[in-house]
């Protein structure tokens, strides 16, 4: 192998190698591929054709600004996709449309300021969605009920100022257990905002300046679930 990746038990570690493209000489039976801390700007779908057995792909800490929807077509078994610390700014309906088997999607520390349309609507098996450390100003992730199996929604360190029922009720059919909203500038809990996620087990609001009246409002809304 010309690439300096280390391969063991179907796991390829290609991290910290200053790679500018996806290696094309790894064993075709690998199931885990770590490409973190490189210089990847794109993930051409064609480069993953030979790695169709992948269940986990970690491309965190690169400079990826756009994803080809066809990537997941080449990776039909992919369950974990980690894109943290990249330069993604926009997600479209197509971005993850073929990633239908994902259970974890990590998008923390990108430049996503708004979610429009329904980029996660095909993720019926998703359990963890991490959008922390982005520029999101609201919790709106779609326009229709979706993410039926989502258990963890991580939205810490964004710019969320209000929790609204019309944004959170896309989770009406989900099993959301953990909602992480720490380090946001929350100033409002609108009436009924927790109705759709009444089975919540943990609501995390560390480093949120609530104050007495907002705390009272929060408690009232939680009591109404």
């Amino acid at each position: 192998s010309t690439t300096k990746c280390t391969v063991s038990h179907e796991v390829a570690d290609c991290s910290h190698l200053k790679l500018t493209q996806v290696p094309d000489d790894l064993p075709t039976n690998i199931t885990v591929l770590n490409l973190t801390h490189n210089q990847l700007r794109r993930l051409p779908a064609a480069n993953f054709t030979r790695y169709s057995q992948l269940t986990s792909l970690d491309v965190g800490f690169n400079t990826i600004s756009k994803l080809e929807p066809e990537l997941c077509q080449k990776l039909p078994m992919l369950k974990v996709l980690n894109l943290q610390h990249n330069e993604l700014s926009q997600l479209s309906d197509k971005t993850f449309a073929f990633c239908t088997n994902l259970t974890e999607l990590h998008l923390m520390s990108n430049s996503i300021q708004k979610i429009k349309n329904n980029p996660f609507v095909k993720q019926k098996n998703l359990i963890t969605l991490d959008l922390s450390h982005n520029g999101l100003s609201s919790t709106k992730l779609g326009t229709q009920v979706q993410l039926e199996n989502l258990q963890e929604l991580l939205l810490s360190n964004n710019k969320i100022q209000a929790l609204k029922s019309e944004e959170l009720d896309i989770f009406a059919n989900s099993s959301l257990k953990k909602l992480e909203l720490s380090s946001n500038q929350i100033k409002e809990f609108s009436p009924g905002c927790f109705h759709a996620i009444g089975r919540l087990f943990g609501l995390f609001l560390n480093n949120v300046q609530l104050g007495p009246s907002l705390t009272e409002k929060l408690c009232l809304e939680l009591a109404n679930t």
Partner: antibody, heavy 122, light 108 residues
């Protein structure tokens, strides 16, 4: 097989309210796999989206900017139908009005009503 | 995706291939749907999600979408395909029913 049956007057006077109803069979207006809306087509012109309703834990509507101040779309779950009201009509609102079902997840229109020609004239 | 542009008319000889374009800024990032409308009738969905064909729609209808242009292709065009064709997409920020201006397909 989904069917949409439109009803309502074909002639409305200027400044009055245009009211149309769309009765649904083969699906439910409260379905969470579809949205419901109205589209119009002025004589010899293209299709113009007017608005939709869709349900999550409650009903939501979205309206075209061109008619936002005058339009209301309401569901009637007991009769499994939805309606269009367009206030303060002018002759420019003369068109064939269609009700439609928008299929999730990406809002293609898979079923249309038969269309109702509404003429605005005194 | 607030503006979709279509050519007003396209002509094709019977048996030939007709291509109708629908252009818009970065339209390839959106799903595009296509409708056929014959005079005096309601539109009919012929292609959804760029390239999917509803049941009952002949195989000669196909679609593609990338970059700034979506295309409806009718292979082996027949006289019965003469109609107006509309592309449509949606954008939750602006409109759930953005339509192109329509293209009149004439089969010569």
């Amino acid at each position: 097989q989904v069917q949409l049956q439109q009803s309502g007057p074909g002639l409305v006077k200027p400044s009055q309210t245009l009211s149309l109803t769309c009765a649904i069979s083969g699906d439910s207006v409260s379905s969470n796999s579809a949205a419901w809306g109205w589209i119009r087509q002025s004589p010899g012109r293209g299709l113009e989206w007017l608005g939709i309703i869709q349900i999550r834990s409650k009903w939501y509507n979205d309206y075209a900017l061109s008619v936002k101040s005058r339009i209301t779309i309401n569901p009637d779950t007991s009769k499994n139908q939805f309606s269009l009201q367009l206030n303060s009509v002018t002759p420019e609102d003369t068109a064939v009005y269609y009700c439609a079902r928008y299929s999730y997840p990406f809002y293609s229109i898979d079923y249309w009503g038969q269309g109702t020609l509404v003429t605005v004239s005194s | 995706q607030s503006v979709l542009t279509q050519p007003p008319s396209v002509s094709v000889a019977p048996g030939q291939t007709a291509r109708i374009s629908c252009s818009g800024d970065n339209i390839g990032s959106y799903y595009v749907h296509w409708y056929q409308q014959k005079p005096g009738q309601a539109p009919v969905l012929v292609i959804y999600e760029d390239s999917e064909r509803p049941s009952g729609i002949p195989e000669r209808f196909s679609g593609s979408n990338s970059g700034n242009t979506a295309t409806l292709t009718i292979s082996g065009t027949q006289a019965e395909d003469e109609a107006d064709y509309y592309c449509q997409s949606y954008d939750s920020q602006f409109s759930f029913g953005v339509f192109g201006g329509g293209t009149k397909l004439t089969v010569l």
